[in-house]
């Protein structure tokens, strides 16, 4: 049978040939009659055999990390017969390890984030080195980790590579640390190889700082002309934290006047002082308010850092603005009777300069030929007024500061012209009536109505009468309907076109005014030649042909 021990060849041997071991048949008596042959992987190139003795040599430098075993086949032949002495057999040559590989950190670069103020013992990251040497061969691949840089804030567990915090850190003092870790093989014994890696450890922010005003006093100004909502200035607190932990909210702590507000610009983290109510320099020319600032987000466990909010005082000076004159009323309504003489008093308007200077005021009326205004604001008439021409006047009164003619205010003034009874009633239209020669007594000739240009205080009431002369000798009579109309009726039977072709009746119309006014109005009545049916007529004026139907009402 075959005789051999297990074969090992150390890696990285520099000699031209290294004796690995010996293969032999137990039938070999040493008389050189047997020939040994090596077949298979690496035979002839990596390993050779002494054909006479069976000694195997490695003729190449081997790298265990490249290839750690070779499976070869051995043959032994009797030279005299050419026959195999033993059956072909496989054997293994193992490449034994030497410590020729340093530990390597394959997952570089390492970066970790840990919250600032984390307690001692907090796990940061685990670093792992690999050693290509044989882990089953002594301590060649047994590693120990140590910290080369990073004390006193960090520590590393020697066997695991776990980095932990060993001292609390404040991000506001230093926000990142470079830690250097060394891995040594041979568990750190002499002859060990080492590798290092750098770990960037960043501290994440916790909200351990409250916002603080750098300024204890801010001075701001606001124009008295500023509308509500105007931004009058900004205030700013500073927070050493970052991101969400530095977001802050400003608010008013004291403002007795409730004139101001503060809103927060969340992009710039500034407080914007806003005018909540309009200010008046003449009423109050300075204000004092107190503002405070707090973080927007505060975790319960970090409340100890946020017990008292930072405050600041804001002095606000109101700037005087030359304001236009101010009328006592937004508009005026005056009344004046019509027909009052030129120069009559209408009313007084009054404007004042709201500024401390108290400039005298000049008044004017825009585009009016009927009224005048003096420097005291007194409005008078320049003409007699007729209500029946214009019952209302809409005036625009302008007040101008004497010392600054650009400061102008205007208001409307409404003048109502009051009625007096200065118009008598009169026919509402021109009336021309007709009567047939054969008309009977009591026949309605015309219904008349009147109008009065005066304004009725309650309601117009007109009274209709014939003149005294017509009453005494009239062929016609009048009946007042008591509704501001009257009817004219025939007072006899039969008329003669040739003798009296036309009648002129004087009608008196009186109103119910105080004093009452009366007018005399003439009604013309034509006598016509009517046919039997009474539907056509021929009057004295042949050009006038009318078709009429007479009927007594």
């Amino acid at each position: 049978g075959w005789v051999w021990n297990q074969f090992f060849v150390p890696e990285e041997m520099n000699t031209t040939s290294h004796h690995v071991g010996r293969l032999r048949s137990d039938l070999d008596n040493g008389n050189n009659s047997f020939q040994y042959k090596l077949l298979g992987a690496g035979a002839g190139s990596t390993f050779i055999i002494d054909e006479r003795t069976g000694d195997i040599y490695a003729i190449e430098k081997l790298d265990r990390e490249e290839r750690s075993l070779y499976i070869l086949r051995a043959q032994v032949i009797d030279i005299t017969t050419g026959r195999a002495v033993e059956p072909e057999s496989e054997f293994v040559i193992k490449v034994s390890d030497i410590n020729d590989n340093e530990p390597k950190f394959l997952d570089e670069p390492y970066e970790a984030i840990v919250p600032e103020m984390s307690p001692e013992g907090t796990l940061v990251i685990q670093v792992t080195a690999s050693d290509a040497d044989d882990p089953s061969s002594g301590n060649n691949a047994r590693l120990l980790y140590s910290l080369l840089q990073g004390q006193p804030y960090f520590s590393v567990e020697p066997t695991t590579g776990v980095i932990r915090i060993s001292s609390k850190m404040d991000r506001e003092l230093q926000d990142e640390y470079w830690v250097i870790i060394q891995a040594k093989d041979m568990i750190g014994q002499p002859g060990a190889l080492s590798g290092t890696t750098s770990v960037l450890i960043k501290l994440s922010d916790v909200n351990d700082n409250k916002p603080i005003f750098k300024e204890s006093l801010y001075r701001l100004t606001v124009s008295e002309s500023a509308p509500t909502g105007t931004s009058i200035g900004t205030i700013m607190a500073y927070d050493n934290d970052i991101g969400e932990n530095a977001e802050m909210d400003y608010s008013i702590e004291e403002d007795d006047s409730q004139t101001f507000d503060i809103i927060t610009n969340h992009e710039t983290q500034e407080g914007i002082v806003i005018l909540k109510k309009k200010v008046n320099f003449e009423h109050q020319n300075h204000y004092g308010i107190r503002a405070k600032v707090k973080n927007h987000h505060v975790d319960e466990q970090l409340m100890k850092y946020h017990t008292e909010a930072s405050t600041t005082f804001i002095k606000i000076q109101v700037e005087d603005v030359d304001e236009p004159p101010l009328f006592l009323l937004p508009y005026y309504i005056f009344e004046i009777f019509e027909e009052t003489p030129q120069g009559s008093f209408v009313g007084v308007v009054s404007a004042t300069d709201p500024d401390n200077r108290k400039s005298p005021i000049r008044y004017s009326i825009t585009r009016s030929k009927v009224f005048n205004i003096d420097d005291n604001g007194t409005i008078t008439t320049t003409n007699s007024l007729d209500r029946e021409i214009s019952a209302w006047y809409n005036l625009s009164i302008t007040a101008t500061e004497k010392y600054n003619i650009e400061q102008i205010s205007s208001i409307p003034v409404y003048v109502q012209v009051l009625n007096i009874n200065d118009h008598a009633p009169e026919f509402s239209q021109y009336y021309e009536s007709y009567v047939c020669e054969n008309a009977g007594s009591g026949q309605v000739i015309q219904t008349i109505s009147a109008v009065d240009r005066d304004e009725s205080i309650e309601e117009h009431h007109f009274y209709f009468n014939l003149s005294v002369e017509d009453t005494n000798s009239s062929s016609f009579t009048i009946i007042d309907n008591q509704d501001n109309t009257a009817v004219i009726l025939t007072n006899r039977t039969g008329f003669n076109l040739q003798e009296e072709p036309i009648f002129y009746i004087s009608i008196l119309i009186a109103d119910n005014g105080i004093p009452s006014l009366t007018s005399t109005n003439t009604l013309t009545i034509h006598v016509c030649d009517c046919d039997d049916s009474g539907s056509t007529q021929t009057c004295q004026y042949q050009e006038l042909m009318l078709s009429m139907g007479f009927k007594t009402e």
């Epitope: 298979g40 992987a41 490249e66 075993l69 496989e90």
Partner: antibody, heavy 120, light 108 residues
């Protein structure tokens, strides 16, 4: 897991040099115990081993191609490359890269392959 | 170099049948250094068996390998539709590494 991907021109002129690169992902080319190999397959034919390389640079080539073949490695890019010079139409084939387990010599895994045609 | 001869060149079988593929080496090969691969059209080869008889990860147990010296066999106990492909043997025993010419298993 480890994956391999071949890349390079699909057409090469006769007498020129064929150049291919294999990019390794999901693992390091610097891992011990593996060779990084090139194999080719002529259209409709069997497989032919071209050669392989260890990450430290040691190469092993098929004697039939040795005079024309160069395999190199770039550990920083996790890539290895094949150069085959003086190509002829007979070099038209699908070229595969694969990982070889150095102790026992099996190929696993393989790239999906890239067809290289040698033509003028 | 070691020449690996695969037979038959083509094997026509039906799903469910047993397939026996042969790989003969021109000289003795260590069984540790023999592997089998499966290749489907348009795809790269896939490792089935290494060390002559060990199944690769994820390979169904209907695939088995055996043999030593110069004669090696791949057996598919019961053919599934996805098993129809070309099969190659490969040796690592002696440089250069060589592959067999392949056996095509096709549907009958």
């Amino acid at each position: 897991q480890v994956q391999l991907q071949e890349s390079g021109p699909g057409l090469v002129r006769p007498s020129q040099t064929l150049s291919l690169t294999c990019t390794v992902s999901g693992g390091s080319i610097s891992s011990g115990g593996y060779y990084w190999s090139w194999i080719r397959q002529h259209p409709g034919k069997g497989l032919e081993w071209i050669g392989y390389i260890y990450y430290r640079g040691r190469t092993y080539y098929n004697p039939s191609l040795k005079s024309r073949v160069t395999i190199s490695v770039d550990t920083s890019k996790n890539q290895f490359s094949l150069k085959l010079s003086s190509v002829t139409a007979a070099d038209t084939a699908v070229y595969y890269c694969a990982r070889v387990y150095s102790n026992y010599g099996w190929f696993d895994p393989w790239g999906q392959g890239t067809l290289v045609t040698v033509s003028s | 170099e070691i020449v690996l001869t695969q037979s038959p060149g083509t094997l026509s079988l039906s799903p469910g049948e047993r397939a026996t593929l042969s790989c003969r080496a021109s000289q003795s090969v260590s069984s540790s250094y023999l592997a089998w691969y499966q290749q489907k059209p348009g795809q790269a080869p896939r490792l089935l068996i290494y060390g002559a008889s060990s199944r690769a990860t994820g390979i169904p147990d209907r695939f088995s390998g055996s043999g030593s010296g110069t004669d090696f066999t791949l057996t598919i106990s019961r053919l599934e539709p996805e098993d129809f492909a070309v099969y190659y043997c490969q040796q690592y025993d002696t440089s250069p590494l060589t592959f067999g010419g392949g056996t095509k298993v096709e549907i009958k």
